[in-house]
């Protein structure tokens, strides 16, 4: 199997009261909004052949996605929750830039392509989905990286 | 509509093993799981385990690991669960439930499968 | 496992009040607890889902709160059908566990 390398994040992140419960407010608000309950993008498909150890590059990727193409995008939405949200996750992300697998992750990317391309067939809509599901976004982040 | 339809009610004697089975109808069955739940008579509920319809996937409550097997059979959309080396105390309803995955609530039940383990 | 306990264990109140039951978790499970309500010989029917999403049917006098230990499931105006045994579920690990219950009893 693949060996990831600097695939942790400490647990203190996962802890801290204030900016974990305005992380799950955001996405209880865009789950409000989500009409489409019988999409999951976070789930067993999602991490399907995906070993224990590379979970946390598989969330890794998964995490910048988010970032990039729809919490930066949708920026302006459900505040006061994204502007405290997005840079915490962000800091999230930088500090798993150094995370890595040597060997194949073909298995990791097609699945992650699948979640991606769920996305973006839903649209807007497939947007607001990933936002309502930042909850299971950040307690997979957490059971896979620490 | 969705719905989930468990197998009839069991006698079985101590030491025996019994499997119930659990018919999903009215939804995708492999975008759920399936977990499983007991009520003893008179009792509250337990939690038992939890299938993945899509991967087969389980993980079991530690007090019934070794003697528990949950499966799917996704070409009938059933589930199963097959509990080993019966004793009297695992005299139960014994309840299938719809579970969207990770971290969710069970949104839809089986009406319930009563074991009666009795020598 | 987490261990989920609920207060009261028994409930006596009338048609019209207000009622409120406790549910703490024996650490933090964030907001993954559901409230189920069971009648006898009936299977149970989840209320409220993620400590306070009303489930789809669930009638909207039912309210749920709290995050992270602490967590109470409300019935604004107690009806007659409301008299049943209410169970919360922590789902903040992968083994999920169950509050021993509440039976809410006409006084």
């Known amino acids: 199997a693949p060996i990831s390398s600097h695939c942790r994040l400490d647990k203190s992140n996962f802890q801290q009261p204030y900016i974990t419960n305005r992380t799950f407010m955001l996405a209880k608000e865009a789950s409000l909004a989500d009409n489409n309950t019988d999409v999951r993008l976070i789930g067993e498909k999602l991490f399907h052949g995906v070993s224990m150890s590379e979970r946390c590059y598989l969330m890794k990727q998964v995490l910048n996605f988010t970032l990039e193409e729809v919490l930066f995008p949708q920026s302006d939405r459900f505040q006061p929750y994204m502007q405290e949200v997005v840079p915490f996750l962000a800091r999230l992300s930088n500090r798993l830039s150094t995370c890595h697998i040597e060997g194949d992750d073909l298995h990791i990317q097609r699945n992650v392509q699948k979640l991606k391309d769920t996305v973006k067939k839903l649209g807007e809509s497939g947007e607001i989905k990933a936002i309502g599901e930042l909850d299971l976004l950040f307690m997979s982040l957490r059971n896979a990286c620490i | 509509q969705v719905q989930l339809v468990e197998s009839g009610a069991e006698v079985k004697k101590p030491g025996a093993s019994v499997k119930v089975s659990c018919k999903a109808s009215?939804?995708?069955?492999?975008?759920?799981?399936i977990s499983w739940v007991r009520q003893a008579p008179g009792q509250g509920l337990e939690w038992m385990g939890w299938v993945s319809a899509y991967t087969g996937n389980t993980n079991y409550a530690q007090k019934f690991q070794g003697r528990v097997t949950m499966t799917t059979d996704t070409s009938t959309s059933t589930a199963y669960m097959e509990l080993r080396g019966l004793r009297s105390d695992d005299t139960a309803v014994y309840y299938c439930?719809?579970?969207?995955?990770?971290?969710?609530?069970?949104?839809?039940w089986g009406q319930g499968t009563l074991v009666t383990v009795s020598s | 496992d987490i261990q989920m306990t609920q207060s009261p264990s028994t409930l006596s109140a009338s048609i019209g009040d207000r009622v409120t039951i406790t549910c703490r978790a024996s650490?933090?499970?964030y907001h993954w607890l559901a409230w189920y309500q069971q009648k006898p010989g009936k299977a149970p029917k989840l209320?409220?889902?993620?400590?306070?999403s009303l489930a789809s049917g669930a009638p909207s006098r039912f309210s749920g709160s709290g995050f992270g230990t602490d967590f109470t499931l409300t019935i604004s105006s107690l009806q007659p059908d409301d008299f049943a045994t209410y169970y919360c579920q922590q789902m903040g690990e992968y083994n999920a566990t169950i509050g021993g219950g509440t039976k809410l009893e006409i006084k």
């Open positions: 650490e933090g499970i």
């Open positions: 439930a719809r579970d969207r995955g990770y971290y969710d609530a069970y949104d839809i």
């Open positions: 209320l409220i889902y993620k400590a306070s």
């Open positions: 009215g939804y995708t069955f492999t975008s759920y799981g």
